[in-house]
């Protein structure tokens, strides 16, 4: 049987992207990161 036409089946979840920079002291420079949904990924 042929398939009935449906969408891709993948749901889109909208999440907040937060870029941040954190000063960790003059001798260590800064950490720059990207947080997606509360998890730091970069």
């Amino acid at each position: 049987d042929a398939e009935f036409r449906h969408d891709s089946g993948y749901e889109v979840h909208h999440q907040k992207l937060v870029f941040f920079a954190e000063d960790v002291g003059s001798n260590k420079g800064a950490i720059i990161g990207l947080m997606v949904g509360g998890v730091v990924i970069a």
Partner: antibody, heavy 122, light 112 residues
Framework: QVTLKESGPALVKPTQTLTLTCTFS??????????VSWIRQPPGKALEWLAH???????LYNPSLKSRLTISKDTSKNQVVLTMTNMDPVDTATYYC??????????????WGQGTTVTVSS | DIVMTQTPLSLPVTPGEPASISCRSS???????????LEWYLQKPGQSPQLLIY???NRFSGVPDRFSGSGSGTDFTLKISRVEAEDVGVYYC?????????FGGGTKVEIK
């Protein structure tokens, strides 16, 4: 709110062509993913899916009836029309239209018309 | 065509008691997109069918939580935790994964 209503002749003669119209409100067939199906139910029997038309004019048919069926839509009138040729007494049934939108969480026939009863007899 | 087989054909129930309807498909109804388009509809006496459950286990808007759907592959079940008088009618399972979509023969639920 979403409503659908079927209309057509209550009685047709064998060999004649049946034309049914589904007039709907509360949604548009120009909306991406939207579609309308026709389903029938002979007296005291189960449901049988007949055909479906999508917002982009793609249509699907039940292979067992494909040679007899044509489904079309008039988006401006909010109508879907089903024609069935060479009617036979076994086609006596209540005919329903129902909407199904495939690009949504609820991908199912979520709203149905009240049905129209068609008797095939000479 | 995919054949949908429902059991039992008739189900007499006592109000307040649970009820269960089985539906089996003649082959897998998992769509290539990963979803299983198994639906349950209720046709109350003299009315049009109405959607209860979609994609195996999701309750449609306004459907009481006493209704639940489960299953996978080819074996599916509709359960009513506590049957009420308004639940009487014919229940149909339907697969919408392949053409043509096909319905089960129906299960008539009636009050004892």
């Amino acid at each position: 709110q979403v409503t659908l209503k079927e209309s057509g002749p209550a009685l047709v003669k064998p060999t004649q062509t049946l034309t049914l119209t589904c007039t709907f409100s509360g949604f548009s067939l120009s909306t991406s993913g939207m579609g309308v199906s026709w389903i029938r139910q002979p007296p005291g029997k189960a449901l049988e899916w007949l055909a479906h038309i999508y917002w982009d004019d793609v249509s699907l048919y039940n292979p067992s009836l494909k040679s007899r069926l044509t489904i079309s839509k008039d988006t401006s009138k909010n109508q879907v029309v089903l024609t069935m040729t060479n009617m036979d007494p076994v086609d006596t049934a209540t005919y329903y239209c129902a909407r199904r939108r495939i690009i949504t969480v609820v991908d199912a026939m979520d709203y149905w018309g009240q049905g129209t009863t068609v008797t095939v007899s000479s | 065509d995919i054949v949908m087989t429902q059991t039992p054909l008739s189900l007499p129930v006592t109000p307040g008691e649970p009820a269960s309807i089985s539906c089996r498909s003649s082959q897998s109804i998992v769509h290539s997109n990963g979803n299983t388009y198994l639906e349950w509809y209720l046709q109350k006496p003299g009315q049009s069918p109405q959607l209860l459950i979609y994609k195996v286990s999701n309750r449609f808007s306004g459907v009481p939580d006493r209704f639940s759907g489960s299953g996978s592959g080819t074996d599916f079940t509709l359960k009513i935790s506590r049957v009420e008088a308004e639940d009487v009618g014919v229940y149909y399972c339907c697969q919408g994964s392949r053409v043509p979509p096909t319905f089960g023969g129906g299960t008539k639920v009636e009050i004892k």
